[in-house]
Amino acid sequence: YKLVCYYTSWSQYREGDGSCFPDALDRFLCTHIIYSFANISNDHIDTWEWNDVTLYGMLNTLKNRNPNLKTLLSVGGWNFGSQRFSKIASNTQSRRTFIKSVPPFLRTHGFDGLDLAWLYPGRRDKQHFTTLIKEMKAEFIKEAQPGKKQLLLSAALSAGKVTIDSSYDIAKISQHLDFISIMTYDFHGAWRGTTGHHSPLFRGQEDASPDRFSNTDYAVGYMLRLGAPASKLVMGIPTFGRSFTLASSETGVGAPISGPGIPGRFTKEAGTLAYYEICDFLRGATVHRILGQQVPYATKGNQWVGYDDQESVKSKVQYLKDRQLAGAMVWALDLDDFQGSFCGQDLRFPLTNAIKDALAAT
């Protein structure tokens, strides 16, 4: 099985124990590590952070002691903007310049492949996204002709049904991608006005969502029905939780909220907590399991957080094995307890290790 793990370059800027550099990663934990994110400047793939080249080097030296480890560079992301991707993909010259710029950039900096993180193609971009993937793959095949190992091509796709329908020709893009990471999280957010888990495995009776699509099981099944081969589908598992501020004394699933939860001490983003911050939060909190959805949530005062723990990730791994998927994807290594100092187990990357162990179990 693949264990595809994202590392985010901006995690270096978190203060104190939240700061994570690639040299803190475990070289034997994941089969693939994806560095997020690269930029596109003037139709050319490029660095984003001032010290990206140094961090690329740190990441790729992990392969010195584990030659089986593959590293990819992810281009795009939330801050990149869909419009910028759209302009590049829809113009033949821009798209082809971008594609041509990729192999030498990846080779120079020691990466084994490219991950496309266009979040998200619009309805008019669907065909262009397919063309981008098809032409990129053709370039990778051609570039590898002089006896080089072919560069890998993957994409991170939304798990939301509406986005899947408007953005992706699943059957076509699946032909050209080496694997597809389905982002089976962020199903539920503060915009709903109620509490709810952002990454439930199943819908469950407790689900207050207005639809039956906002869960991992539906998204995976839908992708498979649309023609994604199970052998290429990698299922996303978050090492972060989504939090809410409760608006009343109700604390269950579907309780009214006044907005996102208070920012974490290190991640400093309202409504989001890293797993290592959740471990802190759990001291003195009340933990509940949403039985049908097979995921936990915790409450403390007026704060509510839905997250994944070692038990829920094992359930998710068992599920992906039952569906004969290619493996699991983790967003993100730097949100797990990467130092092993927060979650009281004396174990670095406890969630990712639980996923790895479950994947290896017979």
Epitope: S41, H44, D46, T47, R96, T97, S101, K142
Partner: antibody, heavy 116, light 111 residues
Framework: QQLKESGGGLVKPGGTLTLTCKAS????????VCWVRQAPGKGLEWIGC????????TYYASWAKGRFTTSKTSSTTVTLQMTSLTAADTATYFC??????????WGPGTLVTVSS | DVVMTQTPASVSEPVGGTVTIKCQAS??????LAWYQQKPGQPPKLLIY???TLASGVSSRFKGSRSGTEYTLTISDLECADAATYYC????FGSGAVDSPFGGGTKVVVE
């Protein structure tokens, strides 16, 4: 792995000349081949490039468009056709092979003199 | 269009010294900057690409760095063989190609 330019020489103003860039030990599959010139005692001036597998085609400096045309004539040969030449075009012309806009391999250059 | 301004036009340093050449891009070109060395009667030779990556076979005495839109080539432990003219180049290509990608050049004299 070598590149060699040929076809330079003396040409009258208003005349036409075709330079050839020949590769030995390599072919031009999936490479960008570019032309750069250097007037006597001056700096480097980019003319234009061709993507030899025609994925991104040809592209030129704005001043060279229409008067300079680069083509791939075989797997190891690229040409640069220059028309309406003036004394200002007197220079050593280099061809260079690039992966991503930077040129790792250069020919020794060929001198073009435009004079009556 | 991007304009590359290279300074100084010439510099003289003794053997063993250090030379710093700067190249200012008129707008952001990210890491798409290359440095070349050219000796009289010879074609240019690639030294650095992607702003800081050393080309194959080039001495580690040559170092490229970037700060915003300013790029620097540093030559340390200067040798007589380093006497040459150095050029920076915006290495955008295809749809991103710029009209005048080369800087004006810096002549390095080794005393």
């Amino acid at each position: 792995q070598q590149l060699k330019e040929s076809g330079g020489g003396l040409v009258k103003p208003g005349g036409t000349l075709t330079l050839t860039c020949k590769a030995s030990g390599i072919d031009f599959s999936s490479n960008v081949v570019c032309w750069v010139r250097q007037a006597p005692g001056k700096g480097l001036e980019w003319i234009g490039c061709i993507d030899t597998d025609d994925f991104i085609g040809t592209y030129y400096a704005s001043w060279a468009k229409g008067r300079f045309t680069t083509s791939k004539t075989s797997s190891t040969t690229v040409t640069l056709q220059m028309t309406s030449l003036t004394a200002a075009d007197t220079a050593t012309y280099f061809c260079a092979r690039g992966d991503a806009g930077y040129y790792a391999l250069w020919g020794p250059g060929t001198l073009v003199t435009v004079s009556s | 269009d991007v304009v590359m301004t290279q300074t100084p036009a010439s510099v003289s340093e003794p053997v063993g010294g250090t030379v710093t050449i700067k190249c200012q891009a008129s707008q952001s070109i990210g890491s798409y900057l290359a440095w070349y060395q050219q000796k009289p009667g010879q074609p240019p030779k690639l030294l650095i690409y992607y702003a800081s990556t050393l080309a194959s076979g080039v001495s580690s005495r040559f170092k490229g760095s970037r700060s915003g839109t300013e790029y620097t080539l540093t030559i340390s432990d200067l040798e007589c063989a380093d006497a040459a003219t150095y050029y920076c180049q915006c290495s955008y290509f295809g749809s991103g190609a710029v009209d005048s990608p080369f800087g004006g050049g810096t002549k390095v004299v080794v005393e």
